[in-house]
């Protein structure tokens, strides 16, 4: 640790005195203290001499000697008082800049330690300190306002009692800066804008921050716009607003608009797009396929996206048949606005019934006209199967009718024993009918097919099963002849069980 001579913590001298402060260390040493007049510095090997032959009150201060090469960073200090009867204060700063909630040191140094008992801190022109100002005093350093607040940004003077009268220091301006958490907050309104050529438009760019020192500008396609700025202060924030008013828009006004604000912490920007169109427009679309297939009993949401300007004047969902004249319940229709010019309309169809298959149309209207988007909803059904015995052209025939959607496939099975359903172990024979006859196939209805199995002799103690399946499920009908070998008997002599 360096050593200072004279080896006293404080030195009190009179104005005009010669002061010599010598610092000695193991290596080179440096003096640190407030820049002030009249000092000269001489280095002599491992010692450094700070001296003046004409000390003034301005030399009052703490002088510290450090050894730059010392890894422990040791230092020694001495405080010099230049006791001037006319100048009780040496003020080391015109201005003190701190952040809110930091301690603010106002460096009024007493030039005479004896005066410490009669010191006080005031605002300029003798005004008292603001309420709740918590401060302390050190003759070496000055007054400290603890946890300074923005509102305490004022001009202060230090007061000392000399011979019964108060002597003031020159003033110190305290600037308490708001702690700026980041770049200014930004809003750009609207987020998107569409106008027909000739209409009026307004774009508002605003920025706010706890500190007044920030810049904001609006640019169009990278060109900075010259717009008068409105400034305001509310909710403890400074606000700067730029408003672009366009009386009659044209195509050159279209494009990207960016609102940019910056301060010492950085820059924020936000953008919007302005579209100028020739005339009103109304576009309907769906992310869904317009042809929908849903299993009966399940639910479906039909969604339509609408892009429109100007806004919609009317819209509704309509059921176009073919099963009934019922209309969708309004409570099942829902509208959500994605943004100003885009909306989503949803029709919820829960637990679909057979009579609800058919065409659903969404209609919308704006000054650009009417538009419609139609969905076709077909219900899927698992196959329903029935088998009868009959004679066709004199031949005994099993006739299987299967009804469902999508169109069912038909398979015949012959198996031993009497059973409701043939299992693998019992199967004697399997016939696939790749092309069953389609009996009916109307839009939105089930498809009914018929498959024929010619049987010369109905075997006793055997079961004939017609199986039908589609993507939804399967159905079957087991035909069990009651008396054996009676192929010549009319069909009513035989029973069949579903």
């Amino acid at each position: 640790i360096p050593v200072i001579e004279p080896s006293v913590p404080e030195l009190v001298v009179k104005p005009g005195a010669t002061v010599t402060l010598r610092c000695v260390g193991n290596g080179s040493v440096e003096w640190d203290g407030p820049p002030s007049p009249h000092w000269t510095l001489y280095s002599d090997g491992s010692s450094s001499i700070l001296s003046t032959n004409n000390a003034t009150f301005q030399n009052t201060g703490t002088y510290r000697c450090t050894e730059p090469g010392d890894p422990l960073g040791g230092s020694a200090a001495i405080h010099l008082y230049v006791k001037d009867p006319a100048r009780p204060w040496n003020v080391l700063a015109q201005e003190v800049v701190v952040f809110e909630d930091q301690d603010a040191l106002l460096p009024c140094l007493l030039t005479d330690p004896v005066l410490e008992a009669g010191v006080s801190l005031v605002r300029v022109r003798g005004r008292p300190l603001m309420r709740h100002t918590n401060y302390s005093f050190s003759p070496w350093h000055g007054f400290t306002i603890h946890r300074a607040k923005f509102i305490q940004s004022q001009d202060y003077q230090c007061s000392a009692l000399m011979g019964g009268r108060k002597v003031m220091s020159i003033s110190i301006r305290l600037k308490v800066q708001k702690v700026i958490p980041g770049p200014p907050a930004l809003t750009l309104v609207p987020a998107e804008l569409v106008r027909i050529r000739g209409e009026a438009a307004q774009i508002v760019c605003s920025a706010s921050s706890v500190d007044v020192n920030f810049d904001v500008f609006l640019q169009h396609n990278n060109t900075k716009l010259a717009i008068p700025q409105q400034s305001d202060f509310h909710n403890n924030r400074y606000q700067k607003v730029l408003t672009l008013n366009l009386d009659q828009v044209d195509f050159q006004h279209a494009g990207n608009y960016s609102c940019v604000a910056s301060n010492v912490q950085g820059k924020h920007s936000t953008s919007m797009f302005f579209r100028v169109v020739e005339s009103a427009y109304l576009n309907l679309s769906s992310e869904q396929n317009l042809i929908q297939e849903v299993t009966v009993g399940e639910g479906l949401n039909l969604k339509v996206m609408v892009e429109a300007y100007p806004g919609l004047q009317g819209f509704n969902w309509t059921y176009l048949g073919p099963f009934s004249d019922h209309q969708p319940e309004p409570k099942l229709a829902n509208a959500t606005t994605k943004d100003t010019y885009r909306h989503t309309f949803t029709l919820s169809l829960p637990r679909l019934k057979p009579s609800e298959a058919g065409r659903y149309s969404f209609l919308a209207r704006n000054p650009g006209g009417w538009r419609a988007l139609t969905f076709e909803l077909t219900l899927r059904y698992p196959p329903e199967v029935s088998v009868i015995w009959t004679f066709i052209n004199g031949s005994g025939t099993l006739l299987c009718a299967a009804s469902g959607y999508p169109q069912p496939n038909v398979t015949w099975l012959q198996c031993s024993g009497h059973t409701d359903r043939c299992d693998e172990a019992q199967v004697l024979q399997v016939w696939d009918d790749p092309y069953p006859e389609v009996l009916s196939q109307e839009p939105f209805h089930k498809v009914t097919v018929q498959s024929l199995l010619t049987v010369e002799t109905l075997e006793h103690n055997q079961t004939y099963e017609c199986r039908a399946h589609n993507s939804v499920g399967s159905g079957s009908w087991a035909f069990i002849p009651i008396s054996a070998g009676a192929h010549t008997h009319p069909p009513d002599e035989f029973l069949f069980t579903p």
Epitope: W39, T66, Q94, E95, A104, L105
Partner: antibody, heavy 117, light 110 residues
Framework: QVQLQESGPGLVKPSETLSLTCTVS????????WSWIRQPPGKGLEWIGY???????NYNPSLKSRVTISVDTSKNQFSLKLSSVTAADTAVFYC???????????WGQGTMVTVSS | QSVLTQPPSASGTPGQRVTISCSGS????????VNWYQQLPGTAPKLLIY???QRPSGVPDRFSGSKSGTSASLAISGLQSEDEADYFC???????????FGGGTKLTVL
């Protein structure tokens, strides 16, 4: 060994605020006084102001109304703000350490700031 | 207009001794110590002389400073081509309550 490094935008528009930061490395900002000096192209040096780590500042009277120097000890940095700039403020800005005898013994390499629209 | 006055230029041949003057007033040079700075082309100034006549470590003893009254001077002996630079004087000014500079002297080594 203490080193100083200036940073900030090289171009500022007239009437706007010039903001520069000086980062102190190799030593603590919490001792010594720290200064800003500028030098217009082809001209002499002009002292702008200095600051102590406690926030105490002194400014050149000719610039006082437009200058704020602040310190951030947590980042070992001090900053300069010069408001309402004009073309006459175009200069190389230096940060430097100032000693008891008002000598500038350590300098940054300087940063050129042009004021132009 | 600089507070301290320096000649705008000076020149000398290699090996020669050159002196640069700096004139002030009682509020600066008259009552405070003088510092000198060397600025090589395209670089930052460097402290050359402090407290009238003190050299920081690393500065050759060819450079010396002196002060008398309200004037100061920088002398460079055994001039070398690498001494070609701008030289600035500076001092604390009591009325300004801060440091002031001279306008600078451009030294050319012929």
């Amino acid at each position: 060994q203490v080193q100083l490094q200036e940073s900030g935008p090289g171009l500022v528009k007239p009437s706007e605020t010039l903001s520069l930061t000086c980062t102190v490395s190799g030593g603590s900002i919490s001792s010594y006084y720290w200064s800003w000096i500028r030098q217009p192209p082809g001209k002499g040096l002009e002292w702008i102001g200095y600051i102590y780590y406690s926030g105490s500042t002194n400014y050149n009277p000719s610039l006082k109304s437009r200058v704020t120097i602040s310190v951030d000890t947590s980042k070992n940095q001090f900053s300069l703000k010069l408001s309402s700039v004009t073309a006459a403020d175009t200069a190389v800005f230096y940060c430097a350490r100032i000693t008891v005898t008002s000598a500038f013994d350590i300098w940054g390499q300087g940063t050129m700031v042009t004021v132009s629209s | 207009q600089s507070v301290l006055t320096q000649p705008p230029s000076a020149s000398g041949t290699p090996g020669q001794r050159v002196t640069i003057s700096c004139s002030g007033s009682s509020s600066n040079i008259g009552s405070n110590s003088v510092n000198w700075y060397q600025q090589l082309p395209g670089t930052a100034p460097k402290l050359l002389i402090y407290s009238n006549n003190q050299r920081p470590s690393g500065v050759p003893d060819r450079f010396s400073g002196s002060k008398s009254g309200t004037s100061a001077s920088l002398a460079i002996s055994g001039l070398q081509s690498e001494d070609e630079a701008d030289y600035f004087c500076a001092a604390w000014d009591d009325s300004l309550n801060g440091p002031v500079f001279g306008g600078g002297t451009k030294l050319t080594v012929l």
